[in-house]
Interface confidence: low
């Protein structure tokens, strides 16, 4: 048994048939020594009296809200909350695995920039009686701090029958150099409680690994005489790092029909121009990535070729 | 130790282009390691990350941009406080910063050299033949020595007598490179703020 | 070390479909901006670029060969295989493979490998 | 589609003299240019991408230069193992296209 927060416990539980459960001593907090009786949750059912109580915990049963009391007054409270633990694996019932870039990614993250701050994102089918909360640092063994915001409902969506809810936080290292070499991954530990289940998930990441730029801005188009061609020009993204001669991004240049099937010329380049062929009813997309370490290609920006 | 922002030296350009070929060098061997060695611990998140330049070079801090002296987290590792008088990050060829940061890559560029060649010579010993240093990537290292022009004495590769760890030496690759791969791309960076400067 | 090899019939008949395999080590065209094309030499005459395909399998062709060409890749095996109908002897000429990373232009060729169309 | 034309058709230089081979794109490529050496009987080399970057192991007599329509590739001091023909490459936009070939030869 470990204490999460002030007057809330985790109990971690083997969980197989007829499993012997742990034994907790629960304290009640008062200088009180004489007269105290224990309840569960709502219940007026007297479990034991005295400053402690011994209680087996084997499921989901034994686990809630225990409260001691003297004469009618609540002294204090401990909630208990059950980790399961299944053929040695702790349950993942709470997250969903987004199974991308590989099996078993409950969290996802990525950074705009080298600045230290990052957004991780995490969905669940559960809608309600659902708490979360993470804790980030560099490194583990002597950890440098990074402060994260609270999670939030970020989207709904429907999927088949099902509705599916995507939670997100955003992380701020305390102290980053943009152009410092990670030696330290960052670690996003996210505790989430599910009425009285609780599940951690863990990320371990270098910035550098999971930056995505935003997509190139001010796409224009410029016609040139007497030709189909046009001169595509775009801007590095606001939140791109500087200078951006240290810190450059190279371009991919798509013109792609109005069908998907249709053929898509793409073009590269470390310049903010190209120029290409627009056909009728196609359109132009650009997207970026760090010149010198290859993470994730930004989304599209795009325009009509019209 | 930033870099100063001046007109750019005709003699950048071959600079820019070697660190160029270095990283797509190292970034080629490195993925040749990860698939060769694919049943060793290779890949980012097995490996510890250590770098070999530690405490010997400061590459980072002596070729940081100009616009990032005014943030504290870049400065910290500091020992030496930045010189902002102008006048003498006049011109590039003159600029001591400039001297420090491009001598601190030649430093970084030696000392990977020499564990590389060294590494090289016992995975040759390998009865298994298994995998191998790129000779190109070698080639490049030294072009961009080369390049950068500096005279420093020889070091002399280590030599063992004992018979090598192949298992720990391959894991010893990995982490090398790596850290090379990392180490390259702030070259390229550093190699590409000077050219625009 | 990075290689590439053109593998394929030397003579085809006019109308018939040529396809021409390139097997590749030393890269993967698993991962990042790689691609492989193919290119032809007609006897004594200049290069002319006929197809490209990217890791992620974008393609794209010559526009005046569009209609005839296929190109396809193996990832598993290592190999990119162009395919040219309604062979002519026009067409008459040495095929290259070449790999294309994204800032070096085609820095890797095949050996070629000749092919004649004649009946 | 781009057209690269190459001038001359082919150049004859005396051992140690400087070789300037020229290539005109019929619109602007920016400096998406590549410069390639072919030998007889072996496929063509690359020798310049990105218009004046040389590639590895290229020796630095060669060099190349321009920028939007006109390219240049440079032999400063001719080898007898540089007779080869040289062909000039776009790769700014599709489809790439190459020049006709310079033949370079000793005179």
């Known amino acids: 048994i470990w204490e999460l927060k002030k007057d809330v416990y985790v109990v971690e539980l083997d969980w197989y048939p007829d499993a012997p459960g742990e034994m907790v001593v629960l304290t009640c907090d008062t200088p009180e020594e004489d007269g105290i009786t224990w309840t569960l949750d709502q219940s007026s059912e007297v479990l034991g009296s005295g400053k402690t109580l011994t209680i087996q915990v084997k499921e989901f049963g034994d686990a809630g809200q225990y409260t001691c009391h003297k004469g009618g007054e609540v002294l204090s409270h401990s909630l208990l909350l059950l980790h399961k633990k299944e053929d040695g694996i702790w349950s993942t019932d709470i997250l969903k695995d987004q199974k991308e870039p590989k099996n078993k990614t409950f969290l996802r993250c990525e950074a705009k920039n080298y600045s230290g701050r990052f957004t991780c994102w995490w969905l669940t089918t559960i809608s309600t009686d659902l708490t979360f909360s993470v804790k980030s640092s560099r490194g583990s063994s002597d950890p440098q701090g990074v402060t994260c915001g609270a999670a939030t409902l970020s989207a709904e969506r429907v999927r088949g029958d099902n509705k599916e809810y995507e939670y997100s936080v955003e992380c701020q290292e305390d102290s980053a150099c943009p152009a410092a070499e990670e030696s330290l991954p960052i670690e996003v530990m996210v505790d989430a409680v599910h009425k009285l289940k609780y599940e951690n998930y863990t990320s371990s990441f270098f910035i550098r690994d999971i930056i995505k730029p935003d997509p190139p801005k001010n796409l224009q188009l410029k016609p040139l005489k007497n030709s189909r061609q046009v001169e595509v020009s775009w801007e590095y993204p606001d939140t791109w790092s500087t200078p951006h001669s240290y810190f450059s991004l190279t371009f991919c240049v798509q013109v792609q029909g109005k069908s998907k099937r249709e053929k898509k010329d793409r073009v590269f380049t470390d310049k903010t121009s190209a120029t290409v062929i627009c056909r009728k009813n196609a359109s132009i997309s650009v997207r970026a990535q760090d010149r010198y370490y290859s993470s994730s290609w930004s989304e599209w920006a795009s325009v009509p070729c019209s | 130790r930033n870099l100063p922002v001046a007109t750019p030296d005709p003699g950048m350009f071959p600079c820019l282009h070697h660190s160029q070929n270095l990283l797509r060098a190292v970034s080629n061997m490195l993925q040749k390691a990860r698939q060769t060695l694919e049943f060793y611990p290779c890949t980012s998140e097995e490996i510890d990350h250590e770098d070999i330049t530690k405490d010997k070079t400061s590459t980072v801090e002596a070729c940081l941009p100009l616009e990032l002296t005014k943030n504290e987290s870049c400065l910290n590792s500091r020992e030496t406080s930045f010189i902002t008088n102008g006048s003498c990050l006049a011109s590039r060829k003159t600029s001591f910063m400039m001297a420090l940061c491009l001598s601190s890559i030649y430093e970084d560029l030696k000392m990977y050299q020499v564990e590389f060649k060294t590494m090289n010579a016992k995975l040759l010993m390998d009865p298994k033949r298994q995998i191998f240093l790129d000779q190109n990537m070698l080639a490049v290292i030294d072009e961009l020595m080369q390049a950068l022009n500096f005279n420093s004495e020889t070091v002399p590769q280590k030599s063992s007598l004992e018979e090598p760890d192949f298992y720990k030496t391959k894991i010893k690759l990995c982490i090398l490179l790596h850290a090379f791969r990392i180490r390259a791309v702030t070259i390229d960076r550093v190699m590409s703020y000077l050219n625009a400067s | 070390e990075v290689t590439l090899r053109e593998s394929g019939p030397a003579l085809v008949k006019p109308t018939q479909t040529l396809t021409l395999t390139c097997t590749f080590s030393?890269?993967?065209?698993?991962?990042?901006?790689?691609?492989v094309s193919w290119i032809r030499q007609p006897p004594g005459k200049a290069l002319e670029w006929l197809a490209h395909i990217y890791w992620d399998d974008d393609k794209y062709y010559n526009p005046s060969l569009k209609s005839r060409l296929t190109i396809s890749k193996d990832t598993s095996k290592n190999q990119v295989v162009l395919t040219m109908t309604n062979m002519d002897p026009v067409d008459t000429a040495t095929y290259y493979c070449?790999?294309?990373?994204?800032?070096?232009?085609?820095?890797?060729w095949g050996q070629g490998t000749t092919v004649t169309v004649s009946s | 589609d781009v057209v690269m034309t190459q001038s001359p058709d082919s150049l004859a230089v005396s051992l140690g003299e400087r070789a300037t081979i020229n290539c005109k794109a019929s619109?602007?490529?920016?400096?998406?240019v590549a410069w390639y050496q072919q030998k007889p009987g072996q496929p063509p080399k690359l020798l310049i991408y990105?218009?004046?970057n040389r590639y590895t192991g290229v020796p630095d007599r060669f060099s190349g230069s321009g920028y939007g329509t006109d390219f240049t590739l440079t032999i400063s001091s001719l080898q007898a193992e540089d007779v080869a023909v040289y062909y000039c490459?776009?790769?700014?936009?599709?489809?790439?296209?190459f020049g006709g070939g310079t033949k370079v030869e000793i005179k």
């Open positions: 990105y218009a004046s």
């Open positions: 070449t790999r294309r990373g994204i800032r070096s232009a085609m820095d890797y």
């Open positions: 490459q776009q790769d700014y936009n599709s489809p790439w296209t």
């Open positions: 030393g890269f993967s065209l698993r991962k990042s901006v790689m691609g």
């Open positions: 619109q602007s490529v920016s400096n998406d």
